[in-house]
């Protein structure tokens, strides 16, 4: 049925569609939306309460250490490869994510202020 | 690109075991799930069993769970997959395949393990 | 485990024909639904992935439809290399399961 309606409202051949996404916690029914051109669809579906057990994270990923700071950006970052991934999780090979070079700095300096008023 | 290379044909008597190899070159052999499926003479796919070499958890079809064993070398990018007690029933072609959900699988070429007395 | 009845079992088209294959799952699958084409003597080799995404290599004439338990395999005008068995397959749920499989014939 759900099938039906996509294909009547829609002349659309080829729909894209998102991830399931649980309507609560992280497993069980759920939605996943579809576009094609201007037209979306809702459809209902199922994340495997059995697989998020099994495998956590979808996505999992081996970093290298921290770069040096970018006094441009005020920023560091870090290249992850994939190490394992969800069966069903379409995980980029390679990741990369930044910070601010600071926020260590910053909390470092805390602590010993901390420390010394103690 | 990945390529799977599998070992050589075998010919086995009924209620021996074989092992069959599949060596991975290219991209990262320990980031996908590989996956094992045979197909028996003139039938369809079946799956057996897939294995992570990252951490070797292994997730096994019941219906192989006391005739297949899947294992990996990290060190030499190798997957094998052994059967035990062999019957002529177990005649097929084994093939490796790695997955990964983003772009897709690559097959080894197969392995044809004929069972006969 | 998720039965995958596949129709029609054989399908007689000639080159330039569009082909229409299915794919029925016992129970909602999402979009975990695969396809793949099979020669003799080959590996198989993955056409569609998750119901409906294409694949690198794969030509523009193969597309799939999903999701839910009724899925599609077009060829939009066959080739004669297109004559060979397709398998669909799910990743649903444990174990994965393939389709009894459409074999593409000449007419």
């Known amino acids: 049925k759900k099938k039906e309606k996509v294909k009547k409202g829609s002349e659309c051949s080829e729909w894209t569609w998102g991830p399931c996404t649980p309507s609560s916690k992280d497993c069980g029914m759920g939605f996943r939306e579809g576009t094609c051109g201007a037209q979306t669809q809702r459809v209902h579906c199922k994340v495997p309460c059995n697989w998020k057990k099994e495998f956590g994270a979808d996505c999992k990923y081996k970093f290298e250490s921290w770069g040096a700071c970018d006094g441009s950006t005020g920023t560091k970052a870090r290249q992850g490869t994939l190490k394992k991934a969800r069966y069903n999780a379409q995980c980029q090979e390679t990741i990369r994510v930044t910070k601010p070079c600071t926020s260590k700095t910053k909390s470092k300096t805390k602590a010993k202020k901390g420390k010394g008023k103690d | 690109q990945v390529q799977l290379v599998q070992s050589g044909a075998e010919v086995k008597k009924p209620g021996a075991s074989v092992k069959v190899s599949c060596k991975a070159s290219?991209?990262?052999?320990?980031?996908?799930?590989m996956n094992w499926v045979r197909q028996a003479p003139g039938q369809g796919l079946e799956w057996i069993g897939m294995?992570?070499?990252?951490?070797?958890?292994?997730i096994l079809n019941q219906k192989f769970k006391d005739k297949a064993t899947l294992t990996v070398d990290i060190s030499t990018s190798t997957a094998y997959m052994e059967l035990s007690s062999l019957r002529s029933e177990d005649t097929a072609v084994y093939y490796c395949?790695?997955?990964?959900?983003?772009?897709?699988?690559?097959w080894g070429q197969g392995t044809l393990v004929t069972v006969s007395s | 485990e998720i039965v995958l009845t596949q129709s029609p079992a054989t399908l007689s088209l000639s080159p330039g024909e569009r082909a229409n294959l299915s794919c029925r799952a016992s129970?909602?699958?999402?979009?975990?639904l695969h396809w793949y084409q099979q020669k003799p003597h080959q590996a198989p080799r993955l056409l569609i992935k998750?119901?409906?995404q294409s694949i690198s290599g794969i030509p523009a004439r193969f597309s799939g439809s999903g999701p839910g338990t009724d899925f599609n395999l077009t060829i939009s005008s066959v080739e004669p290399e297109d004559f060979a068995v397709y398998y669909c397959q799910q990743s649903n749920s444990w174990p994965l399961t393939f389709g009894g499989g459409t074999k593409l014939e000449i007419k």
């Open positions: 395949s790695s997955w990964s959900a983003k772009r897709g699988d690559f």
């Open positions: 998750y119901a409906s």
């Open positions: 129970e909602s699958i999402s979009n975990n």
């Open positions: 290219g991209q990262s052999f320990s980031s996908y799930w």
């Open positions: 294995i992570h070499p990252s951490d070797s958890e292994t």
